[in-house]
Structure formats: structure tokens, C-alpha cells
Amino acid sequence: SLETLKALLEVNKGHEMSPQVATLIDRFVKGRGQLDKDTLDTLTAFYPGYLCSLSPEELSSVPPSSIWAVRPQDLDTCDPRQLDVLYPKARLAFQN
């Protein structure tokens, strides 16, 4: 559950994501079928650069509705190709 994920991230708060935690997050996201808004909100609360650690291909599968709550600082470390994917989604999210 999302509460279990939050508890796990709380234990690791302030520390870099370990390979084990990364694997658990990936499995959790895959299990939900997509990176939904609640999950993304949780991940960026603990790992502000989470979106910028995904490839443009991975970002393309993130639904625009999930991007709505993303803060500018969450995109600080993204490169232009990642932003090329995220900006149209953000525009769509705000239009809706």
C-alpha cells in the first residue's frame, strides 16, 4: 500500500535511494500500472529529483494528471530532453 511505501521512505529520509529502495519503488509503481498522482506526491516529498531520475521514455508514460502537483524545484535537475516530455504534460494538466 501507499502507507507502507511512505513508512519505508520515512526510514530512509534524507539519505540517497539505495538500490533496494529503488527496486521496491519500481515494483510498487508497476503494480499500480502507472505513476499516479498520490504516488508521485509521496515520492517527490522524499526525493525531489525523482522525476529527473526517469528517462524521457519512462516519463512519457506518466499521466498528465500526476504532473499537476509537481513543484518547480522538482524539475531543477532535469535535462532538456526530460523537460521536453514534462512541459506538454504540465500544460495539459493545467488546462484540464
Partner: nanobody, 115 residues
Framework: QVQLVESGGGLVQAGGSLRLSCAAS????????MRWYRQAQGKQREWVAS???????SYSDPVQGRFTISRDNARNTVYLQMNSLRPADTAVYYC?????????WGQGTQVTVSS
């Protein structure tokens, strides 16, 4: 603590090639993106290329088709193969390691392309 050390820069004639290396030491992380940036004298730092955790790559328009980014996970090293170099490629090249939490930078290596 993460340390990034770039090497491989130097002076090369236009049309020549160089291979830059960036060796990362320190902790290992779950998801990382390795990026190369460059900064020419008096200009802003600009993004050059990225290699993502998935293994996919992307490039800025000025270097697309000429530069290739790759990595050797066993050696914790990322490379930038630069072919068909132009005077406009002259800059200090920086390696960047991005995680979901932080961003780490190397000290840079100078690349000078003479005409």
C-alpha cells in the same frame, strides 16, 4: 560522499576526436542519470548528453550524431566520445551524476578545438 573525476580533455584539431571519461567513486544509488555539460568562456553552462538508468541516451542538438555517451557499470565510469570536433565545441566539459535526491559535479576537463 560522491566524487566525480573527469579526464581525457586536451587540444585537438577541427575534425578530430577525443574521448572524455568520468570516474565516479563513493556510494552506489538506486537510480542515477549521468550527464555531460559544457561551459565555453563567457557563456552559460549547457547540457550536452545524458545516459539514464534504463540505458537510454539523449543529446543536445549541436552534438547529435557527433558525440556518443556510454557507461561501464563495472568501472563506475561514463564516457563521452566526441567525433568531428569543431572550434565551437571548445569548452570545459563537466560530468554530472543526478540521483533522486542530489546532484553531484566533477571539476571539469578542458577541451580546445583549433581551426
Amino acid at each position: 560522499q560522491v566524487q566525480l573525476v573527469e579526464s581525457g580533455g586536451g587540444l585537438v584539431q577541427a575534425g578530430g576526436s577525443l574521448r572524455l571519461s568520468c570516474a565516479a567513486s563513493g556510494s552506489t544509488f538506486g537510480r542515477i542519470v549521468m550527464r555531460w555539460y559544457r561551459q565555453a568562456q563567457g557563456k552559460q553552462r549547457e547540457w550536452v548528453a545524458s545516459i539514464y538508468d534504463s540505458g537510454s541516451t539523449s543529446y543536445s542538438d549541436p552534438v547529435q550524431g557527433r558525440f556518443t555517451i556510454s557507461r561501464d557499470n563495472a568501472r563506475n565510469t561514463v564516457y563521452l566520445q566526441m567525433n568531428s570536433l569543431r572550434p565551437a565545441d571548445t569548452a570545459v566539459y563537466y560530468c554530472n551524476l543526478g540521483t533522486a535526491l542530489s546532484s553531484y559535479w566533477g571539476q571539469g576537463t578542458q577541451v580546445t578545438v583549433s581551426s
